[in-house]
């Protein structure tokens, strides 16, 4: 009768063994081992028994003890199971990014690992078991679905091995994938809400905002705001799922024309867009000209108005004829004319909207000097001793000098306060000079005696 | 004991097709990936593809993807590597080995090899 | 695609003396687990290659004690201590870390 000791051996991949060989009978004529594996015999005393240590042990294997005695040949087999951790555990590769409310396969291949009866495959999220499975298979594939929720964010998934040799008297040996880490995003179907000017003037600036709610995590949304190619660099302020961006955008004559207007908004791997037109305009003010600035009263002006070939123009509130970008009216200069203002106003549609531009001139006429009975009276009776204040006011354009004399030296104050007194009586040469020429004009002063009783 | 027998040699034209067979025994088929490798003559050894006997997926070398087809009949252990639109260059001796999907302890045993001759 | 460098190209070497051949890969091997899947394979002519060494020094089933690999990161050496008549062949490293999976381009070892 053949014998083997150990009859059952669970040992690591690569690993050794002892193994004896023992028959019944004191004088066996054969007793061996057969084996693929490396073996080296230990020396021991007695021909009924043999120690064998056999090495590098790769797969599991069945050596066989054979003993040949006078009663027959025998054998007896022992099983030697290998253990080995598996190669590589890990999650097949997903997008960081999961959008709220999708399900999520998570897979996870497991490469090697033996004895694969003692083997199990854990997914896992953070330490919750997910799916237990045993490993089946090369790779061994363990898949579960996870319906993503907001909550996610930030969660771990991973996969675990368990190669539990505890019924065997080892270990539980433990292996774990690479986590995966999962970012949860809600990106709301409706597009973001961009207010902006429609139209926008050449070398002036508009503000532009572009807003979304709805948004989880609202940290982590990129906006993208762009005018044509240029790229706007907006002030982004965040709420609890809402963001405003903000951005000043400058236009120039290169950019005139229709002009894409774009705000663009990216969480995880989705994007919603929102394109708008603006007009980038070039409308100068029309411009007013007058024959010349300052004429001299009774001469003849013109007073013309130029504004943006497909501008409609008013001249001090009267339409062109015919109606277009220009217009223009004729004038004999009059001193009532001095200061008048002629204003132009120009209207240019653009993209349905009427903008309007004014400029306004302002016509000086020379006139004058003018002395008049009204501003000038011709004559004073004054008290004598009464304060009284003599007034005569010259008009013209330019204001004339005015001078009032008596017997060429002696002058009337004219605007100021005075006592009256018999010197003041006569009559003066009032004279008003200016550069347009000069008018004289008498005034006469009386001065009345009291009567005394 | 672990034996990987594949099918005898083979002829071809250029533009033809040509299916190796591998048939697996001695070892639970389904325990093990099958890769398939070949040698050109002066070339150094170049590996095609793998197949999970167990779940039928595949991996290929992108040199050979859309080129080699690597199916599994797990009723017959058998594995098979066809490579369509062959041209000269594809003469070359083809192997299959067993290991892990990954290979990563090795291609532990292989087969004795196909030797493919494309030639007009 | 990984390149593996075998030196040298041809080894001729005494009967018990040693040998050693040289693999050095254009990227490091070691794998994100921290393995390093590189192995060596012997082929004896007319016949396909065989395992003798896996994970850079593990023996394969089989495989004298003679035979020993080392190294890490992009430099491996496989070491025979006493060359015997049955190891004249083409030897050849080879890499499973990544994908696609290579092979070096092999040394002949022929008896003096």
């Known amino acids: 009768q053949t014998s083997v000791s150990p009859s059952k051996v669970i040992l690591p991949r690569g690993g050794s063994v002892l193994v004896t060989c023992s028959t019944s009978c004191d004088q066996p004529k054969l007793l061996g081992i057969e084996t693929p594996l490396p073996k080296k015999e230990l020396l021991l005393p007695g021909n009924n028994r043999k120690v064998y240590e056999l090495s590098n042990v790769q797969e599991d294997s069945q050596p066989m003890c054979y003993s040949n005695c006078p009663d027959g040949q025998s054998t007896a087999k022992t099983f030697l199971t290998v253990y080995w951790t598996p190669e590589r555990v890990e999650l097949a590769p997903l997008p960081s990014w999961q959008p709220v409310g999708k399900n999520l396969t998570l897979r996870c291949q497991v490469e090697g690992g033996a004895p694969r009866a003692n083997l199990t495959v854990v997914l896992l999220r953070g330490e919750k078991e997910l799916k237990r499975e045993p490993a089946v298979g090369e790779p061994a594939e363990v898949t579960t679905t996870v319906l993503v929720r907001r909550d996610h964010h930030g969660a771990n998934f991973s996969c675990r091995t368990e190669l539990d040799l505890r019924p065997q008297g080892l270990e539980l040996f433990e292996n774990t994938s690479a986590p995966y880490q999962l970012q949860t995003f809600v990106l709301p179907a409706t597009p973001p809400q961009l207010v902006s000017p429609r139209v926008l003037e050449v070398d002036t600036q508009g503000t532009v905002v572009c807003s979304l709610d709805g948004l989880f995590p609202v940290s982590e949304a990129q906006v993208h705001l762009a005018l044509g190619d240029q790229r706007l660099n907006p002030t982004v302020t965040y709420g609890n799922d809402s963001f405003s961006a903000k951005a000043s955008v400058s236009v120039t004559a290169e950019d005139e024309g229709t002009q894409r207007l774009t705000c663009a908004v990216i969480l995880g791997n989705q994007s919603q867009e929102t394109l708008q037109t603006v007009t980038i305009y070039s409308f100068p003010a029309p411009n007013v000209i007058l024959t010349k600035p300052e004429v001299s009263e009774g001469t003849e002006v013109t007073v013309k108005c130029e504004a943006h070939p497909r501008a409609k123009v008013t001249l001090n509130g009267v339409p062109a004829q015919p109606l277009g970008p220009r217009a223009q009216l004729l004038l004999k200069a009059t001193p009532e004319d001095n200061g008048r203002s002629f204003s132009c106003s120009a209207t240019l549609e653009v993209a349905g909207q009427l903008i309007h531009k004014n400029q306004t001139r302002e016509l000086r006429v020379l006139y004058g000097p003018r002395l008049d009975e009204r501003d000038c009276p011709g004559n004073w009776t004054w008290p004598e001793n009464s304060q009284q204040t003599p007034m005569c006011q010259a008009w013209g354009n330019p204001l004339p000098e005015l001078k009032c004399l008596k017997d060429g030296t002696f002058p009337l104050p004219i605007g100021e306060s005075v006592t009256v007194t018999r010197d003041l009586e006569g009559t003066y040469l009032c004279r008003a000079r200016s550069t347009q020429g000069e008018v004289t004009r008498k005034v006469t002063v009386n001065v009345l005696s009291p009567r005394y009783e | 004991q672990v034996q990987l027998v594949q099918s005898g040699a083979e002829v071809k034209k250029p533009g033809a097709s040509v299916k190796i067979s591998c048939k697996g025994s001695?070892?639970?088929?389904?325990?093990?990936?099958l890769h398939w490798v070949r040698q050109a003559p002066g070339q150094r050894l170049e590996w095609m593809g793998v197949?999970?006997?167990?779940?039928?997926?595949?991996d290929y070398n992108q040199k050979f993807r859309g080129r080699a087809t690597i199916t599994v009949d797990t009723s017959a252990s058998t594995a098979y590597m066809e490579l369509s639109s062959l041209r000269s260059e594809d003469t070359a001796v083809y192997y299959c080995?067993?290991?892990?999907?990954?290979?990563?302890?090795?291609?532990?045993?292989w087969g004795q090899g196909t030797a493919l001759t494309v030639s007009s | 695609d990984v390149v593996l460098t075998q030196t040298p190209l041809s080894s001729p070497v005494t009967l018990g003396q040693p040998a050693s051949i040289s693999c050095r890969s254009s990227q490091t091997l070691v794998y994100r687990n921290g393995n390093t899947y590189l192995h060596w394979y012997l082929q004896r002519a007319g016949q396909p290659p065989r395992l003798l060494i896996y994970?850079?020094?593990n023996r394969f089933s089989g495989v004298p004690d003679r035979f020993s690999g080392s190294g890490a990161g992009t430099d491996f050496t496989l070491k025979i201590s006493r060359v015997e008549a049955e190891d004249v062949g083409v030897y050849f490293c080879?890499?499973?870390?990544?994908?696609?999976?290579?092979f070096g381009g092999g040394t002949k070892l022929e008896i003096k």
């Open positions: 080995a067993r290991s892990l999907y990954f290979g990563s302890s090795g291609f532990d045993y």
């Open positions: 994970k850079v020094s």
């Open positions: 001695g070892y639970t088929f389904t325990d093990y990936a």
């Open positions: 080879s890499q499973n870390t990544h994908f696609p999976y290579t």
């Open positions: 197949i999970s006997t167990y779940s039928g997926n595949t």
